[in-house]
């Protein structure tokens, strides 16, 4: 049995229904069987877990996803073995295997792989700060969202009116969410906002930086 699946990965927003397309061509016999299984990201195919079987004319959803899986066509004997997965969770991200068996059609292995990414908006990020906050010192502002798929990019902005910082005194890394401030001055004090963004939305946090004279302690 030759199985056909999309070549490009599938992306589905959190809470929506994913349709994992799988089709095949074979003269369906009574021994026809379909199995859908799931592998977590980074794990080998050998560690797949079954989520649905069809055999002997009956459908058997199984495992932790069993209440959320069904077939687009039941029975899946018309050449369409497409899986529907409702209310997708972040833990549904991974590789799905569509395997069709139909003895004596052994021309190919009857296996198709589909990568699913569940799209999750960034969670409210956590803003933190470390380093010397006295005049002339350096500090790092960090921003991180615990959730978000694809991984959010981070952008720091300083709120309010302020003099333009000298070039090189503000360097940010959109991937790590870190903003490094060097050669601090009293005018570096103020509120800084980090915005975490992906295709599903954005979320932000704020942090107030107080730069002090060298003799004073730091206040965050």
């Amino acid at each position: 049995v030759e199985v056909k699946v999309p070549t490009e990965p599938l992306s589905t927003p959190l809470g929506k229904t994913a349709e994992l397309t799988c089709t095949y061509s074979t003269s369906v016999g009574d021994s026809f069987a379909l199995e859908w299984s799931f592998v977590q990201p980074g794990k080998p195919i050998s560690e797949s877990h079954p989520i649905l079987y069809f055999t002997n004319g009956h459908l058997y959803p199984t495992g932790s996803k069993s209440k959320r899986v069904s077939l687009l066509q039941n029975p899946p004997t018309v050449g369409v073995a497409t899986l529907k997965l409702t209310d997708v969770h972040p833990s549904d991200t991974g590789t799905y295997l569509c395997q069709v068996n139909n003895p004596p059609d052994f021309y190919t292995n009857g296996l198709g792989l589909i990568n699913l990414t569940v799209l999750v908006p960034p969670s409210n990020p956590l803003c933190s700060q470390s380093g010397q906050t006295s005049v002339g010192g350096s500090t790092a502002l960090r921003c991180s969202s615990s959730e978000g798929a694809p991984k959010p990019v981070y952008n720091w902005v300083r709120l309010g009116t302020f003099p333009t910082p000298s070039p090189g005194s503000m360097v940010q890394d959109e991937v790590s969410g870190q903003l490094i401030l060097t050669n601090l001055s009293l005018t570096s004090s103020g509120t800084y906002r980090c915005v975490a963004t992906n295709q599903m939305g954005s979320a932000s946090c704020e942090l107030t930086l107080s730069v002090t004279e060298p003799s004073q302690g730091r206040v965050a």
Partner: antibody, heavy 118, light 107 residues
Framework: EVQLVESGGGLVKPGGSLRLSCAAS????????MSWVRQAPGKGLEWVSS????????HYPDSVKGRFTISRDNAKNSLYLQMNSLRAEDTAVYYC???????????WGQGTLVTVSS | DIQMTQSPSTLSASVGDRVTITCRAS??????LAWYQQKPGKSPKLLVF???TLPEGVPSRFSGSGSGTEFTLTISSLQPDDFATYYC?????????FGQGTKVEIK
Amino acid sequence: EVQLVESGGGLVKPGGSLRLSCAASGFTFSNSGMSWVRQAPGKGLEWVSSISDGGLYTHYPDSVKGRFTISRDNAKNSLYLQMNSLRAEDTAVYYCARQGVRPFFDYWGQGTLVTVSS
Amino acid sequence: DIQMTQSPSTLSASVGDRVTITCRASENIYSYLAWYQQKPGKSPKLLVFNAETLPEGVPSRFSGSGSGTEFTLTISSLQPDDFATYYCQHHYVIPWTFGQGTKVEIK
């Protein structure tokens, strides 16, 4: 030598019923998917039903669904098509055909003519 | 449903001619296509399956090609026995459908 011989065709009034038969020989019938394909006079071919090797799975196009029933008796090497609620547009030569491992038709019978007319 | 469209509907040719018949599918059917030959008053005969595979006994002057939505049946040198009607059929997802046929007649 593979042989498929259809029978049971004839003249029937609209709304009537007819049962076609196909006798198979020369191959292992119980291992083969089978289909019926029809051809209206002077027209092209239309697949009308299929059945899996043991009869568990049957399929039909929308044009005949709910009116036609395909069945088989592997002990008798026979394929059947029960046609109910016949319409004028069902008038055609009905061929019994064996399916390959993929669903193309590698052997065909000689056909039996069904005429639906008042 | 997948629609199959053949062209031309009729083709006039002479013995020895190279003849090409085209079949288009309304959506991607990969290589799941069969060709049949039918002579008047006879049942169809399988010529090609999986777009390009010839069953045993089919003369090598017949060849099939194509994938996706565009397919061709070629007769490299038309013989007297080849004057007939030719049909394409997809063997992908049900319902399996046929083209309307191409009649190859003597010029």
